[in-house]
């Protein structure tokens, strides 16, 4: 035989691997250390999900994941004596959890939620294709600042979509926004397959429209000043300023990433106010301005949801047609 280094001893498998669900979408696996592990071994546990995703080596005998339980999910766990990823772990033990039973065609589809102005969340969904028209839906939600799962009370319909909204206010000076809201929709009679979603609080945020405070002309420039929606700081927003001129029938849209009120023409030190100068505007014609805002990627993951347009404000004179 060759005189190479002795292979590292493979540890026995972990025992009592079990899985449970907390809240709506927090899946937790726990296990016990292997029986008969080598005494000079400092135990570490290697785990990954069924598709070899999210490998982890840690000393804890538990692992959790926040996941919408719309599909089966499996965790494989093994033990080893070091944190070295190249060390061969014990035989991997697997434990899976399946979504609640039911006809997949009965589950609601397009379940999505929007956090409106960081003050309330509005979720909507379509009925499953294989359900009765008289199905009564219930939406449940949970997030870290709630002690228990809550039921959403304000069910509504918008065309073919069902929806429900619930209060969800941003908590200042906390890691609140780093977390998610867990959502489940099912029917009262238990006939449909429940649907789940996880809404990160840094995405799908729709601000309220801004409020135009002042329009003024200086030479041929139009100075626009507006108040941003409550709950947002200006550096976290992008803006779109639309100017319509009644005489030339022009329609100009300006995409504004920074809207500081630095010019002396602007009213200064007004809290949560933004400003923009529109160049080359004819003062002796009627100009109508409206503004909308959206979150930006400095503060949020998502930058796709524009607010509704602000109320219009006009400045200048409408010329008499002769």
């Amino acid at each position: 035989g060759g005189g190479g280094a002795a292979p590292t001893e493979t540890q026995p498998p972990v025992t009592n691997l079990s899985v449970s669900v907390e809240n709506l979408c927090t899946v937790i696996w726990t296990w016990n250390p292997p029986e008969g592990a080598s005494s000079n071994c400092s135990l570490w546990y290697f785990s990954h999900f069924g598709d070899k995703q999210d490998k982890k080596i840690a000393p804890e005998t538990r692992r959790s994941i926040e996941v919408p339980l719309n599909e089966r999910i499996c965790l494989q766990v093994g033990s080893q004596c070091s944190t070295n990823e190249s060390e061969k772990p014990s035989i991997l033990v697997e434990k899976c959890i399946s979504p609640p039973e039911g006809d997949p065609e009965s589950a609601v589809t397009e379940l999505q939620c929007i956090w409106h102005n960081l003050s309330y969340m509005k979720c909507s969904w379509l009925p499953g294709r294989n359900t009765s028209p008289d199905t009564n839906y219930t939406l449940y939600y949970w997030h870290r600042s709630l002690e228990k799962i809550h039921q959403c009370e304000n069910i509504f319909r918008e065309g073919q979509y069902f929806g429900c909204s619930f209060d969800l206010t941003k908590v200042k000076d906390s890691s609140f926004e780093q977390h998610s809201v867990q959502i489940m929709v099912k029917d009262n009679a238990g006939k449909i397959k429940p649907s789940f979603n996880i809404v990160p609080l840094t995405s799908r945020v729709k601000p309220d429209p801004p409020h135009i405070k002042n329009l003024s002309f200086h030479n041929d420039d139009l100075y626009v000043q507006w108040e941003n929606p409550q709950n947002f700081i200006s550096r976290c927003l992008f803006y779109e300023v639309e100017v319509n001129n009644s005489q030339t029938e022009t329609h100009n849209v300006f995409y504004v990433q920074e809207a500081k009120c630095e010019n002396p023409e602007f009213e200064r030190n007004v809290e949560n106010t933004s400003c923009f100068m529109v160049p080359g505007v004819l003062p002796d014609t009627l100009n109508t301005v409206r503004i909308r805002v959206k979150t930006n990627k400095l503060c949020y993951e998502d930058d796709k949801l524009w607010s509704n347009w602000s109320q219009e404000m006009s400045i200048g004179k409408k010329r008499n047609s002769t």
Epitope: E110, N130, P133, G159, Q160, Y161
Partner: antibody, heavy 118, light 107 residues
Amino acid sequence: EVQVLESGGGLVQPGGSLRLSCAASGFTFSNYAMTWVRQAPGKGLEWVSTISGRGYSIYYADSVKGRFTISRDNSKNTVYLQMNSLRAEDTAVYYCAKEEGHWYFDVWGRGTLVTVSS
Amino acid sequence: EIVLTQSPDFQSVTPKEKVTITCRASQSIGSSLHWYQQKPDQSPKLLIKYASQSFSGVPSRFSGSGSGTDFTLTINSLEAEDAAAYYCASSRGLPYTFGQGTKLEIK
């Protein structure tokens, strides 16, 4: 008044392409699925394709899968049916219909005739 | 796929007569059955939704009944303007399916 109006039909050779449009008015377009149903000359109704209000869910009949593509532009209140690799058996009047409630068609357009022939 | 079979395929009737058209589904579809009327050279129109609910603006002589697999469209006291093809349609699951149609002729 709620209405839908199809356009874009015509004569096309086998293997050719055509794009149908359906302009809708009188309702909140993005809240409703839109469907294309066709009717071959002298025959019954055949469902072709459906797209949900926000465009996330799309469904096709087996007979057109891989050849037809449904899409919608909610800013223009319009739904489209792009038809490629057309066959003689696709010859039909194509109706656009608004879906309501639990999947019934409460508003239909007048239809646009597609003829596939060499 | 749900198959819908209508009967009769064709019916010739006189005004004021009562007409019954049946539609049988190949499997239970609850109340997810709708009836459409198509007059010559026109597009279809919704008559009855969910097996028995009249659509707005539809004359009261049209009524629907049934659930599960067997459904009926009834026209009480037929009028000349009711000459048309009538189709049942299932919306339970996909694909949507239509019956082959029943053509109603007025004598």
